[in-house]
Interface confidence: medium
């Protein structure tokens, strides 16, 4: 479109600061920018994990960018220089691409890495991760877990391992201050005298793996001759009421099973005077207003009514 030319950025590289997947992409300005002293050049950066179908694209005036990646796979990135239109009379001037890649050289065969990694953030308070040892690894193999999230100066190692047969098979995390609503990075690596062990990397956000406690204080209140209100209280802990969804299971006279999902701590049930027995249980889950995903709590203790008391105003266990 134009004779004006601009070089790509120099020294484009991906730097691993040791944060288990949170990487720095950095570069230097292109050579020969003297003609464009009055211009702030921009850079279009594209990057992805190798094998991903989609690139992430950003445009920045800075000489660095940070983002999270899956270190189980390689990373590829490319960048080019853009001259603002103001500097080129509206012509579109961009450099060729500078490209770079990064990957961690894998040690050991894939089967040696931990299997069935499972992390649960109990009641939005206690994080616990568990795993199974790799396939065919010997008992001398031990696994170590490291974690990092934005706010920590460096990656930390688990200090409270769960063990089985002398092997680490899980980690109880300490209190994790200001750790939700941001990427939480984990690496589980291992050592064995006999063979190298493959590392595994995991990334999630804590609010999406919360398993709350079950609801408590289940009660019945007769609203009218044909309506009974079921009520319960939110479980103890830091999760606010606005963050819960509930699932109710109701059994009437050992025959009818009603299940319902509700957002409040009440449910009104249509019933008849012939009802002899009514039981219900409730479980809770963090809702879409507070997380993208979650784990259902265990069911609450069962609350039942039997006999004539159902016609009375309030029924408590």
């Amino acid at each position: 479109d134009t004779e004006i030319k601009v070089n790509p950025p120099q020294d484009f590289e991906i730097v691993d600061p040791g944060y288990l997947g949170y990487l720095y992409l950095q570069w230097q300005p292109p050579l020969s920018l003297d003609h464009f002293k009055e211009c702030t050049v921009e850079y279009e950066l594209k990057y992805r994990n190798i094998g991903s179908e989609t690139w992430k694209t950003i445009i920045t005036k800075n000489l660095h960018y940070k983002d999270g990646f899956d270190l189980n796979k390689g990373i590829e990135a490319k960048i080019h220089t853009l001259l603002p239109w103001q500097c080129t009379n509206g012509s579109e001037v961009q450099s060729s691409w500078a490209e770079t890649t990064y990957w961690i050289s894998p040690q050991g065969i894939p089967e040696t890495k931990v299997q069935d990694m499972d992390c649960v953030y109990y009641n939005w308070q206690y994080l616990l991760c568990s795993w199974k040892p790799g396939i065919g690894v010997l008992l001398d193999t031990n696994y170590n877990l490291f974690y990092w999230y934005e706010g920590l100066d460096h990656a930390l190692q688990c200090v409270d391992y769960i063990k089985a047969d002398g092997q680490n098979i899980g980690c109880r995390f300490p209190y994790l201050e200001a750790s939700d609503y941001k990427d939480f990075y984990i690496c589980v690596n291992g050592s064995s005298e006999n063979k190298p062990i493959r590392s595994s990397y995991f990334t999630f956000q804590l609010q999406n793996i919360v398993k709350p406690l079950p609801p408590v204080y289940l009660t019945f209140t007769r609203e009218s001759s044909c309506e009974i209100k079921l009520k319960w209280s939110i479980p103890l802990g830091p999760i606010p009421a606005r963050c819960f969804d509930y699932e109710i299971e109701i059994r009437e006279d050992d025959t009818t099973l009603v299940t319902a999902t509700v957002e409040n701590e009440t449910y009104t049930l249509k019933t008849t005077n012939e009802t002899r027995q009514l039981c219900f249980v409730v479980r809770s889950k963090v809702n879409i207003y507070c997380s993208d995903d979650g784990i259902w709590s265990e069911w609450s203790d069962k609350q039942c009514w039997e006999g004539e008391d159902l016609s009375k105003k309030t029924l408590l266990r």
Partner: antibody, heavy 119, light 107 residues
Framework: QVQLVQSGAEVAKPGASVKVSCKAS????????TQWIRQAPGQGLEGIGA????????SYNQKFKGRATLTADKSTSTVYMQLSSLRSEDTAVYYC????????????WGQGTLVTVSS | DIQMTQSPSSLSTSVGDRVTITCKAS??????VAWYQQKPGKSPKLLIY???YRYTGVPSRFSGSGSGTDFTLTISSLQPEDFATYSC?????????FGQGTKLEIK
Amino acid sequence: QVQLVQSGAEVAKPGASVKVSCKASGYTFTSYWTQWIRQAPGQGLEGIGAIYPGDDDTSYNQKFKGRATLTADKSTSTVYMQLSSLRSEDTAVYYCARGATLLRPFPYWGQGTLVTVSS
Amino acid sequence: DIQMTQSPSSLSTSVGDRVTITCKASQDVSTAVAWYQQKPGKSPKLLIYSASYRYTGVPSRFSGSGSGTDFTLTISSLQPEDFATYSCQQHYSIPPTFGQGTKLEIK
């Protein structure tokens, strides 16, 4: 000079899909983003998404994610926009346009393709 | 997405008049605003980019100003060929979003 030539008008039934093409010439096809923008009768312009033919990178307006699919054929310097599950509100003129990047205005536009959704 | 609100939606005016069209962004977009002219049955034509820079070949009677959230397109002396619809666009963040357009009609 830069030219974007789009395919002809289309009539489609609700629930069907339509594929509009945009053939580029006069520049290095793989080095620039091609945007798709639509304009319903009497309405303003609305961005659908963009594709970078150099590596098939795409960027979709959230409103059209899952319904619009952008593809590029390097051998013919043509970009395609397919819109599925059509409804009457999708009746519009669909434009392809070229900017240097995702965040540049569009000095070059196709002539537009009228898509009419009607049962 | 950033909303672009344009006013007025239509304007009856005469050749030789000075015309001002405004565009308000729902959040700060620095100076990343473009203006387009569109005539019936035709594609939009880029007039102004980066709030105040005239695109190649655009007559000097067209000028743009503003930064942050408030932007203005001014036509200093309206010519017969300027009767058209004018739209603003933010090119600050993805997806690009446009104003609803201002139609200039002959009084």
